[in-house]
C-alpha cells in the first residue's frame, strides 16, 4: 500500500457495431479503480462496471433500451482500497464521454451474403439479416427490424472473367439482377444508411462467386 493521487480517465471512446457498444478509456489503472455511469439527457445516472480495474465497459444492455436516445457516460476514478490517501473531502475525479446516439452512430457490421440463386438470366441474391442485441417483446431484432427503410444494401457484381463492376441497390435484403447466360458472376454487398452523416457504410461483405457452395442454379 502507499499514498498516491488518482488520475482522471481520458480518451473516452465509444466502440459500437450493430448496437454492441463498449466504452473504452485510458489509462491502465495503477492504485486506482474505475466506475462507469451512463445516462440519457433526461435520465438518472446508472452505475455499470462498478469498482473495476478494466479500461472498457460493455454498455450494450443500457443503450439497447432505446437506441434513438442520446447517451452520455462518465468514468470515475477512485483510489484503490489499499491506498492510504488522506485528503480533505472532495468529489471523485471523473471524465465525460462524448455524447452517443446509437441509431445514428453505431457502425454497420460487415454484411454476409446468405445465398444466391440463378434462374435463367436472373440471379436472386439474399443478404443475411443480422441479429442485433436490441430487444422487443423478449426477442432480438434484426438490423432490418431496427432500421427499416433507412437501411439499404448496395450489391457489387461482376463477371468472374472481367473486372468491370456493376451495382444495384435495395431497401429489402434481396436483389434480383440480370446476368448473361453461361457467365459466372461474383458478388459483394455493403450496408448503407444514406441519411447518416457519419458511419454511413459498412465494410464490404466477403466476395461470393457463382459455381461455389452458396449458389443454386436452375434453368
Amino acid at each position: 500500500s502507499g499514498t498516491t493521487n488518482t488520475v482522471a480517465a481520458y480518451n473516452l471512446t465509444w466502440k459500437s457495431t450493430n448496437f454492441k457498444t463498449i466504452l473504452e478509456w485510458e489509462p491502465k489503472p495503477v492504485n486506482q479503480v474505475y466506475t462507469v455511469q451512463i445516462s440519457t439527457k433526461s435520465g438518472d445516472w446508472k452505475s455499470k462496471c462498478f469498482y473495476t480495474t478494466d479500461t472498457e465497459c460493455d454498455l450494450t444492455d443500457e443503450i439497447v433500451k432505446d437506441v434513438k436516445q442520446t447517451y452520455l457516460a462518465r468514468v470515475f476514478s477512485y483510489p484503490a482500497g489499499n491506498v492510504e490517501s488522506t485528503g480533505s473531502a472532495g468529489e471523485p475525479l471523473y471524465e465525460n464521454s462524448p455524447e452517443f446516439t446509437p441509431y445514428l452512430e453505431t457502425n454497420l457490421g460487415q454484411p454476409t451474403i446468405q445465398s444466391f440463386e440463378q434462374v435463367g438470366t436472373k440471379v436472386n441474391v439474399t443478404v443475411e439479416d443480422e441479429r442485433t442485441l436490441v430487444r422487443r417483446n423478449n426477442t432480438f431484432l434484426s438490423l432490418r427490424d431496427v432500421f427499416g427503410k433507412d437501411l439499404i444494401y448496395t450489391l457489387y457484381y461482376w463477371k468472374s472473367s472481367s473486372s468491370g463492376k456493376k451495382t444495384a441497390k435495395t431497401n429489402t435484403n434481396e436483389f434480383l439482377i440480370d446476368v448473361d447466360k453461361g457467365e459466372n458472376y461474383c458478388f459483394s454487398v455493403q450496408a448503407v444508411i444514406p441519411s447518416r452523416t457519419v458511419n454511413r457504410k459498412s465494410t464490404d461483405s466477403p466476395v461470393e462467386c457463382m459455381g461455389q457452395e452458396k449458389g443454386e442454379f436452375r434453368e
Partner: nanobody, 114 residues
Framework: QVQLVESGGGLVQPGGSLSLSCTAS????????MGWHRRSPGKERELVAV???????HYADFVKGRFVISRDNAKNAVYLKMNFLTPEDTAVYYC????????WGQGTQVTVSS
C-alpha cells in the same frame, strides 16, 4: 476531513450474525463509493464489500453470499449484515468512503469464537 464512525462490532459464536453500521460526519455525495474493509491479525487490510450511490455492489470472493452491504444516502450511512460467521472472519472492520481520496473509520472489532 470526512469522519466515519462504526458501530455494531462484538463477540459472536460461529454460525452467528452481526450487523455493522457506519455514519459519516458530513454529507457524502452519491458519487462516493462506500464500503467495508477488514484487517485480520497478521494480515493486510482487505476489501470486504463496496456499494455505489445507486446501490450497485461488489463483494470480495470470501464473502460467498454470507454478507449483505446496503447504503442510505439520506443518512450518509453504510451497513454490513454478516451471516454465517466463522472464526476466519475475526478482524477489525473499517468503514470506508472513497471520493477524491479514501477516508477510513477507526474500526470496530468483530470476534467470532465459541
Amino acid at each position: 476531513q470526512v469522519q466515519l464512525v462504526e458501530s455494531g462490532g462484538g463477540l459472536v459464536q460461529p454460525g452467528g450474525s452481526l450487523s455493522l453500521s457506519c455514519t459519516a460526519s458530513e454529507t457524502i455525495s452519491s458519487t462516493y463509493i462506500m464500503g467495508w474493509h477488514r484487517r485480520s491479525p497478521g494480515k493486510e487490510r482487505e476489501l470486504v464489500a463496496v456499494i455505489s450511490g445507486d446501490g450497485v455492489t461488489h463483494y470480495a470472493d470470501f464473502v460467498k453470499g454470507r454478507f449483505v452491504i446496503s447504503r442510505d444516502n439520506a443518512k450518509n450511512a453504510v451497513y454490513l449484515k454478516m451471516n454465517f460467521l466463522t472464526p476466519e472472519d475475526t478482524a477489525v472492520y473499517y468503514c470506508y468512503a472513497a471520493g477524491r481520496w479514501n477516508h477510513w473509520g477507526q474500526g470496530t472489532q468483530v470476534t467470532v469464537s465459541s
